[in-house]
Amino acid sequence: GSERTCCPVNWVEHERSCYWFSRSGKAWADADNYCRLEDAHLVVVTSWEEQKFVQHHIGPVNTWMGLHDQNGPWKWVDGTDYETGFKNWRPEQPDDWYGHGLGGGEDCAHFTDDGRWNDDVCQRPYRWVCETELDKASQEPPLL
């Protein structure tokens, strides 16, 4: 495949990445699948600067990101190391709260009103952000 050099229509370019901001809500798995079908992934926040950029675009809205601990440890969907990477949890989060009555704990991370992160039940229909890197090879065949 060829290297993507500019962002698709309706995506926002920032620091060699393209971002797409949903305006409806989906469960985390559906949001994750949506991004994959767009040859992208749920947003992976690697710096305070990227956090501020995403926060500015989503506003004060609960929004899924590409971070989960459904298989045990917290993991970013693109393989970025969680332990050594950027974190921005709300105080006392993540807490894997079981008191919601929906079954299980809280295994998916989202941006809250003020941008800080919370873990929540993955099935809640929150908005989401997709991200794809400009320098990565796209799945489309090269133009002849």
Partner: antibody
């Protein structure tokens, strides 16, 4: 404007079944969870059941679990409540309710639109 | 289940006078996302409930500013600064932080 219209209520004997329906219009039905809430005569409100926007999850009050089934058809913008093994204590007005409050740019997990309700009377 | 307790259960108010309804929950309604999932509804006679206040203190669109909500954690209050004839009905508080979603018993407000 957003509208929810319930139907299917009536008088039924204990142990029998009834199916309530709710026709939705004026909003993107497939984007919202939907509830059934009931109100017995002269009493307060009791949450009955909820179904997720895509039908993937369903939850019930303990008082109706195993007897009632909530379902939806997003292609027809309809919500149903199948009520089996009805009891006298199920007598109530049943409301179809939209989940989520659309305020500016966000969705909140309250209930912002209620239908007018349909009356179910379980009596021998 | 979270128990919601409203007081008083009935209230008779002179038009133009203030009114206050209390709602207490058996558990905190503060979620990890920083929001508090407490709502107030008014059910006018012969009608379905209508949303007044969401998340403790936010007035829903079209709701007059004489209605205000306050509180945190487990203690909440709905205030009507100057009661009008059209405010009569049954007031319900509701929590949605935990399934099953639960309502208070309702407070009946009437005009003297």
């Amino acid at each position: 404007q957003v509208q929810l219209v319930e139907s299917g209520g009536g008088v039924v004997q204990p142990g029998r079944s009834l199916r309530l329906s709710c026709a939705a219009s004026g909003f993107t039905f497939s984007s919202y969870g939907m509830h059934w809430v009931r109100q017995a005569p002269g009493k307060g409100l009791e949450w009955v059941a909820v179904i997720w926007y895509d039908g993937s999850y369903k939850y019930y009050a303990d008082s109706v679990k195993g007897r009632f089934t909530i379902s939806r058809d997003n292609s027809k913008n309809t919500l149903d409540l199948q009520m089996n093994s009805l009891r006298a204590e199920d007598t109530a007005v049943y409301y179809c309710v939209k989940m989520g409050i659309e305020v500016a740019v966000d969705y909140y997990y309250g209930m912002d639109v209620w239908g007018q309700g349909t009356t179910v009377t379980v009596s021998s | 289940d979270i128990v919601m307790t409203q007081t008083p259960l009935s209230l008779s108010v002179t038009p133009g006078q203030p009114a206050s309804i209390s709602c207490k929950s058996s558990q905190s309604l503060l979620h990890g996302d920083g929001k508090t999932y407490l709502y107030w509804y008014l059910q006018k006679p012969g009608q379905p409930p209508q949303l007044l206040i969401y998340e403790v203190s936010n007035r829903f669109s079209g709701v007059p500013d004489r209605f205000s909500g306050s509180g945190s954690g487990t203690d909440f209050t709905l205030k009507i600064s100057r009661v009008e004839a059209e405010d009569v009905g049954l007031y319900h508080c509701m929590q949605s932080i935990q399934l099953p979603w639960t309502f208070g018993q309702g407070t009946k407000v009437e005009i003297k």
